[in-house]
Interface confidence: medium
């Protein structure tokens, strides 16, 4: 097209630009080591560093690892992207009682409205179920299902949400993403099929490298790239996303190209010593007598650091389950965490990783 010549000519003799025939305009040539954020970059700000899979480019332009959603009570809400961390949220049927960056530190099951109460607002990943008194004359069965949710199959109504019992399987032997999903519920949603895109957004045919957006014609490789599980931090450095591989942690938000993965204590535990994007020390969420039950709503969505309470005190408790079973927080493995050294000495896996990760992805034996 003759009318395109003047535009093409403006690129000639200018080494910092090239002509893109597809869009019929001059484009800025990203310097070596940077990749374009759009098809035809116009200025240096349209070029960026490229990170590896599972890493994102953070505000300081460093590749930093995305968070993991490896805890049983978390699911991935948004994947690890080139400029943002993976984000995790509480799995369906649960809500976040203690938030964390890009994740949730503590998930509880939604409350079931007790007899004489109906659902005012159904629970979400962020909020617990809100109940209200049933109007006089409304039968317990309720005319409208969305206005009244009765406990199914004769379950006892709960006065407050209950945390998930931490898995008692040999999660400590799992590599990075350990533990079994609760009842393998929603397996199709929580377990990636071999050919489906993984959380790092890469095709299964190329598992180790991030999908590189092709550079415009003649522009060369021009996007900063970090290794997998790293994100680009504020200083422009590739930084590892935190890993939630400890048995008492779960992933709240995923690793993105520019933000870290975040971890939180698994259900039934509370963070006694916080750490950047994670918790350095999780302690069992104590049981309390019926008269001392506190409202979890009081702490919903709070980003709080809890100091371990003095022995014998019960700051914020789980009601004893109605069926008389002791909650998992009384298990020996968890009580081991309540230790003066717990913030320094973390649980140590004692065997080699198992052959399959919790997502069914085979783990190669390098031996």
């Amino acid at each position: 097209f003759p009318q395109d010549r003047p535009f093409e000519d403006t690129c000639h003799g200018n080494p910092s630009h090239y002509y893109d025939k597809a869009v019929r305009r001059c484009c800025y040539r990203c310097p070596m080591g940077l990749f374009p954020t759009q098809q035809c970059p116009q200025r240096p700000t349209d070029c960026r560093k490229q990170c590896e899979p599972d890493y994102y480019l953070d505000e300081a332009d460093r590749c930093t690892a995305c968070v993991t959603c490896s805890r049983d009570d978390l699911v991935e809400k948004t994947p690890c992207a080139w400029n943002s961390s993976r984000v995790c949220e509480c799995r369906p049927g649960m809500f976040c009682s203690t938030s964390a960056v890009n994740s949730c530190a503590r998930c509880f099951f939604h409350s079931v409205c007790p007899a004489g109460m109906i659902v005012k607002f159904p629970g979400t990943a962020q909020k617990n179920t809100v109940c209200e008194p049933a109007s006089p004359g409304v039968s317990p069965a309720c005319a409208s299902p969305e206005n009244c949710k009765e406990p199914s199959s004769g379950t006892i109504p709960q006065a407050k949400p209950t945390p998930v019992s931490p898995a008692t399987s040999s999660a400590s032997t799992m590599p990075v993403r350990g533990g079994t999903r609760l009842a393998q519920e929603a397996a199709s949603k929580l377990t990636r099929a071999p050919d489906s895109p993984s959380s790092v957004g890469r095709p299964s045919s190329d598992p180790g490298l991030s999908p590189t957006q092709p550079c415009p014609e003649g522009s060369g490789d021009c996007r900063k790239q970090c290794e997998p599980d790293y994100y680009l931090d504020e200083a422009g450095r590739c930084t590892a996303c935190v890993s939630c591989s400890r048995d008492d942690l779960v992933e709240k938000t995923p690793c993105a190209w520019n933000s870290s993965r975040t971890c939180e204590c698994r259900p039934g535990m509370i963070c006694a010593t916080s750490a950047t994007n994670s918790c350095a020390r999780c302690v069992p969420y104590p049981i309390c007598a019926a008269e001392t039950v506190t409202k979890p709503q009081d702490m919903a969505e709070k980003d709080t650091t809890f100091e371990a309470p003095p022995l014998g005190t019960q700051p914020d408790c789980n009601p004893t389950p109605e069926n008389g079973e002791a909650p998992a927080s009384t298990s020996p493995t968890q009580s081991l965490l309540v230790d003066s050294q717990a913030s320094k000495t973390l649980p140590i896996p004692t065997s080699a990783p198992v052959a399959l990760s919790s997502t069914g992805k085979p783990v190669l034996d390098a031996g």
Epitope: C63, P175, V176, D229, C238, S243, A366
Partner: antibody, heavy 123, light 107 residues
Framework: QVQLVQSGAEDVRPGASVKLSCKAS????????IHWVRQRPGQGLEWIGY????????DYNQKFKGKTTLTADKSSNTAYMQLNSLTSEDSAVYYC????????????????WGQGTTVTVSS | DIVMTQSPKSMSTSVGDRVTITCKAS??????VAWYQQKPGQSPKVLIY???YRYSGVPDRFTGSGSGTDFTLTISNVQPEDLATYYC?????????FGGGTKLEIK
Amino acid sequence: QVQLVQSGAEDVRPGASVKLSCKASGYTFTTYTIHWVRQRPGQGLEWIGYINPSSGYSDYNQKFKGKTTLTADKSSNTAYMQLNSLTSEDSAVYYCARRADYGNYEYTWFAYWGQGTTVTVSS
Amino acid sequence: DIVMTQSPKSMSTSVGDRVTITCKASQNVGTNVAWYQQKPGQSPKVLIYSASYRYSGVPDRFTGSGSGTDFTLTISNVQPEDLATYYCQQYHTYPLTFGGGTKLEIK
């Protein structure tokens, strides 16, 4: 099994250049980045940078920018590191390495290493 | 860059002893730390990743722990074949950095 086989020892003069190779086998070459690590005599390990064989993208430790150039040849499953303007300070063992493929997260710790190439710079 | 300070630089121990090597990061690196063993004339071999996970085939006498800035490699019941130099590595933020190494000698 995964193997990284590096080229033989090099004796070079100051000011010269040298190109080291790292041939990968036992896996799909374009699937993993190849990293290079330097170890001077009696010293510790220093990360130089990596090359993405699939895209040709490379990233360097600022300390080694200008000194090293990383490339890869997909047809021969080989990664290369060229060292320029050599001085006695560049005398070292150079390793190529590859991260592991454990679990679902791909952090950069190295499960596979080449045997190393010794570069001696002397007049 | 993140500096990994390893101590001690060298240590002498006897077969059957328990030794502890520490590594301190100049800033928080979460649990993104690996430990390597390098025997004389050989390439490094990974022992521990994610601060506390033993790599496949590594004897269980090697134990890693720590998070944030303080990390430890413990070798219980030291064996003659453990004569080597041990390195920690942070892979939290690029550039990747290693500790200066700890040379373990067997009496």
